[in-house]
Interface confidence: low
């Protein structure tokens, strides 16, 4: 079914980081427009991005309603200037997306080291708890709020004068590590959801080193 002059969308791809979720597809339209619909497996279809010439549609507002649901989307193709004109079966061409479960599949965004503080031979490293677009009671939840103990952070740290890395893990947003007195250290963190089978790890945070402005040193 479909019209003679429209082309079905293809390569429907979910792009999602920290629940900011965009559906992308091809081709760039020539004399046609698109409308996107999204649904949970047990719900009704909801239309978004009506009659657009874009090849992407931000579906964040829909998926954050329940990030543990599995979503499907489909992209309808209509001839430009005449969205009522459909094919012999009375339906426009459409293509289905792969399934998408935000909680299991959204990419973990690059974390940021918020601060580090040295007290004697201990250093406390704090990871910024990034805000997501998931709402509860009219407030935006943080990554930790959403994932709870499913989310851990791995800290990589090393002496500035050496390349040998050590690691530490936490299921909070803070690390307390032992360091050698008088040595400067550099740090990088990575977000990890160990229970996942895909998209388990974020990219590493930017490296932060002692002696720079993020840190605080206190001699005891």
């Amino acid at each position: 079914s479909g019209t003679t002059n429209t082309v079905a969308a293809y390569n429907l791809t979910w792009k999602s980081t920290n629940f900011k979720t965009i559906l992308e597809w091809e081709p760039k339209p020539v004399n046609q427009v698109y409308t996107v619909q999204i649904s949970t497996k047990s719900g009704d279809w909801k239309s978004k991005c009506f009659y657009t010439t874009d090849t992407e549609c931000d579906l964040t507002d829909e998926i954050v309603k329940d990030v543990k649901q599995t979503y499907l989307a489909r992209v309808f193709s209509y001839p430009a200037g005449n969205v009522e004109s459909t094919g012999s079966a009375g339906e426009p061409l459409y293509e289905n997306s792969p399934e998408f479960t935000p909680y299991l599949e959204t990419n973990l965004g690059q974390p940021t080291i918020q601060s580090f503080e040295q007290v004697g031979t201990k250093v406390n490293v704090t990871v910024e708890d990034e805000r997501t677009l998931v709402r509860r009671n009219n407030t935006f939840l943080s990554l930790r709020d959403v994932f709870g103990k499913d989310l851990i952070y791995t800290l990589y740290y090393w002496k500035s004068s050496s390349s040998g890395k050590k690691t530490a893990k936490t299921n909070t947003n803070e690390f307390l590590i032992d360091v050698d007195k008088g040595e400067n250290y550099c740090f990088s963190v990575q977000a990890v959801i160990p229970s996942r089978t895909v998209n388990r790890k974020s990219t590493d945070s930017p490296v932060e080193c002692m002696g720079q402005e993020k840190g605080e040193f206190r001699e005891i």
Epitope: S1, Q37, S39, T40, K41, S42, G43, D44, W45, T70, L72, R74, A89, E91, N96, E99, T101, L104, T197
Partner: antibody, heavy 124, light 107 residues
Framework: EDQLVQSGGGLVHPEGSLRLSCAGS????????MNWVRQAPGKGLEWVST???????YYADSVKGRFTISRDNAKNSLYLQMNSLRAEDMAVYYC??????????????????WGQGTTVTVSS | EIVLTQSPATLSLSPGERATLSCRAS??????LAWYQQKPGQAPRLLIF???NRATGIPARVRGSGSGTDFTLTISSLEPEDFAVYYC?????????FGPGTKVDIK
Amino acid sequence: EDQLVQSGGGLVHPEGSLRLSCAGSGFTFSNYAMNWVRQAPGKGLEWVSTVDTGGSTYYADSVKGRFTISRDNAKNSLYLQMNSLRAEDMAVYYCARDLLVRGALGYYYGMDVWGQGTTVTVSS
Amino acid sequence: EIVLTQSPATLSLSPGERATLSCRASQSVSNYLAWYQQKPGQAPRLLIFDASNRATGIPARVRGSGSGTDFTLTISSLEPEDFAVYYCQQRSNWPFTFGPGTKVDIK
């Protein structure tokens, strides 16, 4: 490879009970609605029951109140508890997965992966 | 419940011929219809979903069409592996019902 492996069939007396199991592998079990379909000897296919991803259950009138469908996503498993079995329940039982979407303009992919089938014989 | 009627009950054809199978619903099922193939001693196999979409791995000679109450499964040129029983199934309303099947056998 996406696969469903069944177990638990056998011979049972009328009014007896039996529990069928179906183990999924190769796919994210919790993402799919799961079904039981049966086929009496020499007959066609008959839908028996569905459990959706949210745990809601649906039954054919012929088994309502006697059969219970359940799932354990942690074990990637589907179950059918059959009580008060009758001669007309004698059939090959298949488990099948599908991607189920209901509602206006909804669609579904159909039952795309099936178990190998298990025979339930009801006889005195 | 929605009753599906399939015709003919048996279709006797030769390899290379065109097979046209019909499925009629007692009330509209929109496009919530699937077709399955079943061979003796085997589990059913999904051919068509959403009335007209071929499932993964199904050859282009198999085609589904129709909407509302009248649906057709067409196999453009029968291969030896196509001789089997074919069932339609509706998912418009609970209970989900199957048709009685059409047997395609070798003439």
